[in-house]
């Protein structure tokens, strides 16, 4: 058993049929010694008396808010949550496996640049009685500070018969060094509580591996005289790290016909312009990627040929 | 070339070679063998390799003030990785395919380190750690980890040379 926060405790249980459970001793936070009784949740049934209460925690029915009283007055509370371990593996019932980039990916994170700011998100089908708390650091043995905000519900989607809820959080490394080569990964830890079930999820990554630039901005076409060719030009996104001579991007320019089946013409360039042939009803798209490290491409920025 | 007197390196040449190194490091990574072994792990090999850190002067301001600190750090890293790529980790079982980009990568690391340091002048280099793989699966794991870490190192080096070529070239 360990303390999650004041008066909230997590009991770690090996979860299998007829498991013996864990013996837990609760102590009433009071100077009083006599006349103390214990109840669980809203029930008025007295579970025991005395300053301490010993219980065998085996299942969710044994978890909940234990309260000690004296003469009708509440002295203190202890909320017991359960953390299930099945066959040596902690349960992951609350969050959905996003399966990208690999199985058992519950948290996904992205950064728009090297400033040390990043966003993480996760999915669940649970709509009520759900709380999240997020902590983060750079490294784990001698952790350096990363500050995270509160997790918020950022999207709701219908997936078949189910509703899916997306939560996200923004974090910022306290003393980021954008030009350095990271040697210690960022650790993100999410505590999830649903009713009386506790679970924790972690992700470990380097900012360089979660970089995804915003799409190029100001995408423009300039027809070339007496030619089907056009000069496409664009600019670095505002959110990208500066100076651009140091934090350089590379670009992919694509000409795509109206039909998805039509052959796509692609050009790769380090410049912020390119000359392509503009077909009727086609569109021109440009996306960006870090020039020197193959993290994610940005989403496409597009303009119609006409 | 970065010479003892502190004159400038051939920024444009270094830029071109460091960008080639980036490409090679990424093309070598998937080709060192099939790999399901978790690339995480509670102990990181990357603790044993030289990193371009915050105080090494490789940021744009540091390069403007005095690029020598940064260039020395890059040189140290290039020599270190060049030794690793020539070690038993890459030459032992399982054998790399004859056309593996690791050979080219090895040669290019040496090429860039020579551009930075002419004969006769020696910056101190770091000892290569004893990672002591005794099994082929351990060598394979180390190859992946070393190449991942090399990709990060050469990316910073390439940024340094690109910025130098754009802003510090005579």
């Amino acid at each position: 058993i360990w303390e999650l926060k004041k008066d909230v405790y997590v009991v770690e249980l090996d979860w299998y049929p007829d498991a013996p459970g864990e013996m837990v001793v609760l102590t009433c936070d009071t100077p009083e010694e006599d006349g103390i009784t214990w109840t669980l949740d809203q029930s008025s049934e007295v579970l025991g008396s005395g300053k301490t209460l010993t219980i065998q925690v085996k299942e969710f029915g044994d978890a909940g808010q234990y309260t000690c009283h004296k003469g009708g007055e509440v002295l203190s509370h202890s909320l017991l949550l359960l953390h299930k371990k099945e066959d040596g593996i902690w349960s992951t019932d609350i969050l959905k496996d996003q399966k990208e980039p690999k199985n058992k990916t519950f948290l996904r994170c992205e950064a728009k640049n090297y400033s040390g700011r990043f966003t993480c998100w996760w999915l669940t089908t649970i709509s009520t009685d759900l709380t999240f708390s997020v902590k983060s650091s750079r490294g784990s043995s001698d952790p350096q500070g990363v500050t995270c905000g509160a997790a918020t519900l950022s999207a709701e989607r219908v997936r078949g018969d189910n509703k899916e809820y997306e939560y996200s959080v923004e974090c910022q490394e306290d003393s980021a060094c954008p030009a350095a080569e990271e040697s210690l990964p960022i650790e993100v830890m999410v505590d999830a509580v649903h009713k009386l079930k506790y679970e924790n999820y972690t992700s470990s990554f380097f900012i360089r591996d979660i970089i995804k630039p915003d799409p190029p901005k100001n995408l423009q076409l300039k027809p070339l005289k007496n030619s089907r060719q056009v000069e496409v030009s664009w600019e670095y996104p505002d959110t990208w790290s500066t100076p651009h001579s140091y934090f350089s991007l590379t670009f992919c320019v694509q000409v795509q016909g109206k039909s998805k089946r039509e052959k796509k013409d692609r050009v790769f360039t380090d410049k912020t312009s390119a000359t392509v042939i503009c077909r009727k009803n086609a569109s021109i798209s440009v996306r960006a990627q870090d020039r020197y490290y193959s993290s994610s491409w940005s989403e496409w920025a597009s303009v119609p040929c006409s | 070339r970065a010479v003892p007197g502190g004159s400038s390196p051939a920024w444009t040449q270094c830029q071109q070679l460091s960008q080639k190194l980036c490409t090679l490091a990424w093309s070598a990574h998937p080709l060192v063998g099939h790999m399901d072994l978790r690339e995480e792990g509670d102990e990181e090999t990357t603790n044993d390799v030289p990193h371009i850190q915050c105080g090494d002067g490789c940021d744009p301001q540091g390069l403007r003030d005095n690029s020598q600190f940064c260039l020395q750090r890059i040189h140290q890293g290039l020599i270190f990785y060049e030794k690793l790529l020539g070690s038993d980790i890459f030459t032992g079982e399982p054998s790399l395919l004859p056309d593996s980009p690791v050979g080219q990568l090895h040669a290019s690391l040496l090429g860039l380190s020579q551009l930075l340091q002419p004969e006769g002048h020696h910056w101190e280099t770091q000892q290569i750690p004893s990672l002591s793989p005794s099994q082929p699966w351990q060598r394979l794991l180390l190859r992946f980890k070393i190449l991942r870490s090399l990709q990060a190192f050469v990316a910073v080096a390439a940024r340094v040379f690109a910025h130098g070529a754009a802003t510090l070239s005579p």
């Epitope: - | 072994l37 082929p136 351990q138 794991l141």
Partner: antibody, heavy 121, light 111 residues
Framework: EVTLKESGPVLVKPTETLTLTCTVS????????ISWIRQPPGKALEWLGV???????NYNSGIKSRLTISKDNSKSQVVLTMTNMDPVDTATYYC???????????????WGQGTTVTVSS | DIVLTQSPDSLAVSLGERATINCRAS??????????MHWFQQKPGQPPKLLIY???NLESGIPDRFSGSGSRTDFTLTISSLQAEDVAVYYC?????????FGGGTKVEIK
Amino acid sequence: EVTLKESGPVLVKPTETLTLTCTVSGFSLTSYAISWIRQPPGKALEWLGVIWTGGGTNYNSGIKSRLTISKDNSKSQVVLTMTNMDPVDTATYYCVREGDYGSYAGAMDYWGQGTTVTVSS
Amino acid sequence: DIVLTQSPDSLAVSLGERATINCRASESVDYYGISSMHWFQQKPGQPPKLLIYRASNLESGIPDRFSGSGSRTDFTLTISSLQAEDVAVYYCQQANKDPYTFGGGTKVEIK
């Protein structure tokens, strides 16, 4: 289908040399390592040695001086030679494929049926 | 050599009940976070069969009532609901250092 089959004498006299051949099919010896493992009657398993994809070998130091493992990739055969046999070497000898280096980390995914060798005069 | 000590030597479990076998290594069998510990099942007159590789990965074709956990020196094989066909001897094996070594085996029977 992956198969490994051991062949060789079932009876060997003390001080003689044992030669066992492992013939494999369904995969190439240039892609997978082969180990030899033995099991005395009613006892646990003992690893004898391995021949890697490139032809290099590692042996159990306890019997290294008596062992040689070689292979012929084109014939898909691996040969174990063990000199100076003794009655304590009586065991079932298995030829075993080591799983893909990058996934299995030294786990042995396919085993031959084994051949029982008795050392007796 | 790395010595692997299995416990218990034998185990009698009722059908449908849980069976747990432990394997302790005399030194860590982890290499940069990868546990080179594997589990095998051997039935009488048959060669061993790979069940679990790298401590916790289920070999293809093996029922998911078998699971493995642990790292460094302490490892566990669990059969969540014992079936009649699970009666066998179970061995752990390490491949972190030469020579590869096996545990002494745990015999699982039906109570």
